[in-house]
Interface confidence: low
């Protein structure tokens, strides 16, 4: 294979937004290989060397009045500006989750099973998934994949409930998400038949 | 206090491959990248291009500066090369799997550097190219990279899939397997 040494340069300009655009922090960061060498932090107001490798750049950029002024203005000219341009399709993007409940394996009643609540295709990633048994919230025996980013502006998560289903029990997966005003609920009823569908 | 949102303009330039990237990231998702060969803006979701525009020429100018800066830093570091960090690979589906219902396999390649990978989808051991897509290299907070590859497919009990990943940090290609799990009862939905 190709064993030649590699050399990587990574600039990153970061805008961190708090409470909309009320508070904004701008970071102009530079990485050689995987190591940060120099940065401008709007909370600091000047360029700082992060490693010795970045010292010449920090000193030079701080000596250049126009570069420093541009960096200090970036919270407005760059960050708030870009937030405004993209807000409608990023900050305000809402995609409702599709919620499905199924047992992880086909088991007769009164056998240990994992009930899976699959929540998929939603945006943004902030979500609350709860399990209820006959109306009472189940807090023990819950296992989750955590939030999974699909890379296409959707998320998914699986929240499993360890349980021994008994006939007549009603399990409910409840999902709260910014795309809906009231929680989404999906029921699963423990029945003796193996195939269950509504 | 944790921020609500983060927008990152992420760039890189890699030698001796002479590969560069310019992209915008919002909360971990790509808004767009600039195709260096075609010199055009590529929106991650088509509809984004209806709400905003980005002049690709500006990115090309940045990449030229990045190339010059990399050469300066390489000399300044006394030609210290990057240490290869091998990827973690996960294969999952876009949504719950139902036999013969269209779905998408996702190969998530994470926590690696440098940003060069060779990814192949295999169906029953044979390479598949029809319908496949991929993201550019996405930045991580630890300054490693992430990447997604996608394969639309029809789940069946006969077919097995692998995502095959080659990276300089791996001694041999890494294969992550996926196959249809034993059937469960039909899923529940309620009003």
């Amino acid at each position: 294979g190709d064993t030649r040494p590699r050399f990587l340069w990574q600039p990153k300009r970061e805008c961190h937004f708090f409470n909309g655009t009320e508070r904004v922090r701008f970071l102009d960061r530079y990485f050689y290989n995987q190591e940060e060498s120099v940065r401008f932090d709007s909370d600091v107001g000047e360029f700082r060397a992060v490693t010795e490798l970045g010292r010449p750049d920090a000193e030079y950029w701080n000596s250049q009045k126009d570069i420093l002024e541009q960096a200090r203005a970036a919270v407005d000219t760059y960050c708030r500006h870009n937030y405004g341009v993209g807000e409608s399709f990023t900050v305000q993007r809402r995609v409702q989750p599709k919620v499905t409940v199924y047992p992880s394996k086909t088991q007769p009643l009164q056998h240990h099973n994992l009930l899976v609540c699959s929540v998929s295709g939603f945006y943004p990633g902030s979500i609350e998934v709860r399990w209820f048994l006959n109306g009472q919230e189940e807090k023990a025996g819950m296992v989750s994949t955590g939030l999974i980013q699909n890379g296409d502006w959707t998320f998914q998560t699986l929240v499993m409930l360890e349980t021994v289903p008994r006939s007549g029990e009603v399990y409910t997966c409840q999902v709260e998400h910014p795309s809906v005003t009231s929680p989404l609920t999906v029921e699963w009823r423990a029945r003796s038949e193996s195939a269950q569908s509504k | 206090i944790k921020e609500e949102h983060v927008i990152i303009q992420a760039e890189f330039y890699l030698n001796p491959d002479q590969s560069g990237e310019f992209m915008f990231d919002f909360d971990g998702d790509e808004i767009f990248h600039v195709d260096m060969a075609k010199k055009e803006t590529v929106w991650r979701l088509e509809e984004f291009g209806r709400f905003a525009s980005f002049e690709a020429q500006g990115a090309l100018a940045n990449i030229a500066v990045d190339k010059a800066n990399l050469e300066i830093m390489t000399k300044r570091s006394n030609y210290t090369p990057i240490t290869n960090v091998p990827p973690e690979v996960t294969v999952l589906t876009n949504s719950p799997v139902e036999l013969r219902e269209p779905n998408v396999l996702i190969c998530f390649i994470d926590k690696f550097t440098p940003p060069v990978v060779n990814v192949t989808w295999l169906r029953n051991g044979k390479p598949v190219t029809t319908g496949v897509s991929e993201t550019v290299f996405l930045p991580r907070e630890d300054h490693l990279f992430r990447k997604f590859h996608y394969l639309p497919f029809l789940p069946s009990t006969e077919d097995v899939y692998d995502c095959r990943v080659e990276h300089w940090g791996l001694d041999e290609p890494l294969l992550k397997h996926w196959e249809f799990d034993a059937p469960s009862p039909l899923p529940e939905t309620t009003e």
Partner: antibody, heavy 120, light 109 residues
Framework: QVQLKESGPALVKPTQTLTLTCTFS??????????VGWIRQPPGKALEWLAL???????YYSTSLKTRLTISKDTSKNQVVLTMTNMDPVDTATYYC????????????WGQGTLVTVSS | DIVLTQPPSVSGAPGQRVTISCSGS????????VQWYQQLPGTAPKLLIY???QRPSGVPDRFSGSKSGTSASLAITGLQSEDEADYYC?????????FGGGTKLTVLG
């Protein structure tokens, strides 16, 4: 229990626009997975799917009629409205609305249908 | 535009078994579930079979559905006079729902 009922004019003139309303009860169109569709049936002929609207406001239309159709919903009123422009005598049919209980699911409950005649 | 092909008519005597076929393509039946609806004269269609072979509650087990490749079929055993009706298959094709042309079932005698 789930019920759907279509309402609209029994008679429309050629070139006019038809507006049909489906009023439903027993379920909510804000529930994940649920959709409401429209299907029509000319006298003595087969069913023809027209349009469907999902819980998340995704809209799907018959390929051959999509330029003439618009589907919309009012979740608070439990109503789905279908408009069809440029009506023609061949559009004479019984128009049904029906519920799909999950994404890409079957039509499990149907309205009784409303006969629309297109004639001058 | 009818995309799924059904025979215009089938018939059978009471107690017999009849099948109704529904033929499509890879993009519809091949990739998706099939539903069957029964339409008694002068009434709205009623869901008979969903997801290829599942019966809604209240549908007698004399009715069964199956799918193979790009075709599906509905079987009715122990034919009864009240089964005389029109039967329609339905699937999807690229997010568009598609119906068959319908089959008229006549119960003889």
């Amino acid at each position: 229990q789930v019920q759907l009922k279509e309402s609209g004019p029994a008679l429309v003139k050629p070139t006019q626009t038809l507006t049909l309303t489906c009023t439903f009860s027993g379920f909510s169109l804000s529930t994940s997975g649920v959709g409401v569709g429209w299907i029509r049936q000319p006298p003595g002929k087969a069913l023809e799917w027209l349009a469907l609207i999902d819980w998340d406001d995704d809209k799907y239309y018959s390929t051959s009629l999509k330029t003439r159709l618009t589907i919309s919903k009012d979740t608070s009123k439990n109503q789905v409205v279908l408009t069809m422009t440029n009506m023609d005598p061949v559009d004479t049919a019984t128009y049904y609305c029906a519920r799909s209980p999950r994404y890409r699911g079957a039509f499990d409950y149907w309205g009784q249908g409303t006969l629309v005649t297109v004639s001058s | 535009d009818i995309v799924l092909t059904q025979p215009p008519s089938v018939s059978g005597a009471p107690g017999q078994r009849v099948t109704i076929s529904c033929s499509g393509s890879e993009s519809n039946i091949g990739n998706n579930y099939v539903q069957w609806y029964q339409q008694l004269p002068g009434t709205a269609p009623k869901l008979l079979i969903y997801d290829n072979n599942q019966r809604p509650s209240g549908v007698p087990d004399r009715f069964s559905g199956s799918k193979s490749g790009t075709s599906a079929s509905l079987a009715i055993t122990g034919l009864q006079s009240e089964d005389e009706a029109d039967y329609y298959c339905q699937s999807y094709d690229m997010n568009v729902h598609v119906f068959g042309g319908g089959t008229k079932l006549t119960v003889l005698g």
